[in-house]
């Protein structure tokens, strides 16, 4: 079958109450098929490719574990599965300040280099 | 050929704490993901954690987070599955198993033989 | 976390015919789902990963199909060897979870 190309699918929003949790959905396709390599999920507010994160964990060659590097505040926890296409994250004890566009990303290393991020990313409205 | 062979059947109080061992063999152990599943008797399997032994990192289901710990020494291919604080609904039938990889598609391909937990007071 | 819900809870068929399992997950899972097989006292043992693939040395009897929140485990000619409880399990989210089982038995 083709390769498949870079794509990342995320809902234009999500809505949920201040002291609640959300979940973020993001998933995603490559071309490096079988890529069972380095990699890193990163999820970032405000902008996309300059952002700051708010979460960052890596999954060494071979493995489905995403070791968390950076969760801030402790509140950012990933749900899907990086290894089947899923970058899902979930959001505890939402805040005010947490209204606000999220964007994540997915990078590749080892023997593949290659990134991607979404543009447009995910709206979490907090009411 | 890959075994996973576990320690075997334990007996505690409740409060107390449990530790269980997998050694792993056949395979080269730090490269692959072990995790740690149970079955209470007569239930089904329940995903309790999971550790990379090549980096030490682990994840945890967070019904048990709060009291579960796994670890790994790779200078003997072995993981271990800590369980404190036990309660009556923690008897049961633990096992590690081995989270194979092929192609690109992960999978729990090698099982140990299962270690029985018993809490009684 | 994901609920697995699978149907019928228990099954007995013929030694010869179709058995067929259902596996519903709470939301889509993708393709991530395989199937195990236990018998008693021992360990789960891979069938089918990834919805649709056999493992190395499972006969070609039990194939697997579905994606998204529907699955089914199928085997086509049961033999008195697949008297076993069955499990799906989803990978796609972390915690993994199985399906609560579903007992095989001849009739």
């Known amino acids: 079958s083709p390769a498949q190309r870079w794509s990342m699918q995320v809902p234009p929003e999500v809505s949920a109450e201040a002291g609640d949790a959300a979940v973020l959905p993001c998933t995603f396709t490559h071309p490096h098929r079988h890529y069972d390599g380095p990699l890193t999920a990163i999820w970032r507010a405000g902008e996309p490719y300059a952002g700051p994160q708010v979460f960052r964990c890596a999954a060494a060659r071979g493995s489905e574990l995403c070791q968390t590097a950076l969760s801030l505040h402790g509140r950012f926890r990933l749900l899907g599965n990086p290894r089947r296409n899923d970058l899902s994250l979930r959001v505890e004890r939402l805040a005010l300040a947490d209204d606000r566009r999220y964007f994540c990303r997915v990078e590749f290393a080892g023997d593949v280099h290659d990134r991607y991020e979404s543009r447009h990313g995910v709206r979490l409205h907090v009411t | 050929q890959v075994q996973l062979v576990q320690s075997g059947a334990e007996v505690k109080k409740p409060g107390a704490s449990v530790k269980v061992s997998c050694k792993a063999s056949g395979y080269t152990f730090p490269r692959y993901d072990v995790s740690w599943v149970r079955q209470a008797p007569g239930q089904g399997l329940e995903w309790m954690g999971v550790i990379h032994p090549g980096s030490g990192g682990t994840g945890y289901n967070e019904k048990f987070k709060a009291r579960v710990t796994i670890t790994a020494d790779t200078s003997t291919s072995t993981a271990y599955m800590e369980l404190s604080s036990l309660r009556s609904e923690d008897t049961a039938v633990y096992y590690c198993?081995?989270?194979?990889?092929?192609?690109?598609?992960?999978?729990?391909?090698?099982w140990g033989q299962g270690t029985l937990v018993t809490v009684s007071s | 976390d994901i609920v697995m819900t699978q149907s019928p809870d228990s099954l007995a068929v013929s030694l010869g015919e179709r058995a067929t399992i259902n596996c519903k997950a709470s939301q889509n899972v993708g393709s991530n789902v395989d199937w195990y097989q236990q018998k008693p006292g021992q360990p789960p043992k891979l069938l089918i990963y990834e919805s649709t693939n056999r493992y190395t040395g499972v006969p070609d009897r039990f194939s697997g199909s579905g994606s998204g929140t529907d699955f089914t485990l199928t085997i086509s000619s049961l033999q008195a060897e697949d008297v076993a409880v069955y499990y799906c399990m989803q990978s796609n989210f972390f915690p993994f979870t199985f399906g609560q089982g579903t007992k095989v038995e001849i009739k």
């Open positions: 198993a081995r989270r194979g990889l092929n192609s690109g598609y992960w999978f729990f391909d090698f």
